[in-house]
């Protein structure tokens, strides 16, 4: 069964920076990644970021980059503006769009344990998975 | 703009084989991925192949896996669909459709539709 | 596969009704759901898709809501050309399922 993997991780160097990282386990071409906040698309979510793999990418503030890290990957830099760290408690989502097969979606969020002083770059951010 | 024609249907024999073809313009053809549909006379709608934008995934439900194959000729702009091992239930008028990947794969631009009659 | 329950099958209405189509999933679809609409002689029209978002050209008295497994799609002040068949359609697993259908007649 196809699987989306959702990983937030929360830049050392800048505590208002950001990254949600998403893959795609399974078979067929993906055909559109659809990244959100809040909640998935259409269901109270925000949409932050849509990737096709061709036609190239659409991105919303806070969203500061997205793009395509493998052929069934992305990543997406986000900029907190505010004083305060929102992004820390949201629910960040993915939905990988593959033809034939359908869509997966998965999110997830910032551990609550991260601290960025003791996360050093090598170190692996656990991988949040729930297919919705 | 958009244009879908379909052709090839027409009266066939219980267990025999038709092929339909789909010629596609105004639009870059390789660049969707595209479908055949069919609508029974009982006015239902059935997905019955399916084939990405560059040809290497298809799909068939149970009902015509084995039995239909489909597949594209981006040369020449057409989609195809080979049906073989004809029963009384693939009597239906046949579309060929287009996928938007933007709208969630809805399908956004319909052929005609061709009809297929297999009679006993 | 997943199974797209329409309801109601025939709707009888007069010119300017508010008419609503209802289409229940048998799993989630996530918000992966088209309406078609199907006029007499002619082959399927896109009118929505992502449940609520209306097709190039398609009125503003047309409209989609729900989530999941539950859509509702509505025609605000029925016209006499929306006489037809509407078809909700879900695009979110293989194989792409259709309601069976609702055909819309105007007294």
């Known amino acids: 069964t196809p699987e989306v993997w959702v990983q937030v991780q929360m830049e050392a160097t800048e505590l208002s920076s950001f990254t949600v990282h998403c893959g795609f386990l399974g078979p067929g071409s993906i055909s559109l990644v659809t990244v959100s906040w809040g909640g998935p698309d259409g269901a109270g979510g925000t949409k932050l970021a849509v990737l096709h793999p061709e036609l190239g990418t659409r991105q919303w503030a806070p969203a500061r980059q997205a793009r395509w890290e493998t052929q069934s990957s992305i990543s997406l830099a986000l900029e907190d503006s505010g004083a305060s760290s929102p992004f820390a408690n949201t629910t960040f989502c993915c939905k990988f769009a593959s033809f034939p097969e359908g869509s997966w979606e998965s999110c997830g969020s910032l551990p609550p344990s991260s601290d960025p002083g003791l996360s050093a770059p090598p170190t692996p951010v656990p991988i949040l998975r729930a297919d919705l | 703009d958009v244009k879908l024609v379909e052709s090839g249907g027409g009266l066939v024999k219980l267990g025999g084989s038709l092929k339909l073809s789909c010629a596609a313009s105004g639009f870059t053809f390789s660049s969707y991925h595209m479908s055949w549909v069919r609508q029974t006379p009982e006015k239902r709608l059935e997905l019955v192949a399916a084939i990405s934008r560059d040809g290497d995934s298809t799909y068939y439900p149970d009902t015509v896996k084995g039995r239909f194959t489909i597949s594209r000729d981006d040369a020449e702009n057409t989609l195809y669909l080979q049906m073989s091992s004809l029963k009384s239930e693939d009597t239906a008028l046949y579309y060929c459709?287009?996928?938007?990947?933007?709208?969630?794969?809805?399908?956004?631009?319909w052929g005609q539709g061709t009809s297929v009659t297999v009679s006993s | 596969s997943i199974v797209m329950t329409q309801t109601p099958k025939f709707l009888l209405v007069s010119a300017g009704d508010r008419v609503t189509i209802t289409c229940k999933a048998s799993q989630s679809v996530s918000n992966d759901v088209a309406w078609y609409q199907e006029k007499p002689g002619q082959s399927p029209k896109l009118l929505m898709y992502?449940?609520?978002h209306r097709f190039t050209g398609v009125p503003d008295r047309f409209t989609g809501s729900g989530y999941g497994t539950d859509f509702t799609f509505t025609i605000n002040t029925v016209q006499a050309e929306d006489l037809a068949v509407y078809f909700c359609?879900?695009?979110?697993?293989?194989?792409?399922?259709f309601g069976g259908g609702t055909k819309l007649e105007i007294k």
């Open positions: 359609h879900q695009a979110y697993r293989s194989p792409w399922t």
């Open positions: 459709s287009r996928h938007e990947d933007y709208f969630g794969f809805a399908m956004d631009s």
């Open positions: 992502y449940v609520s």
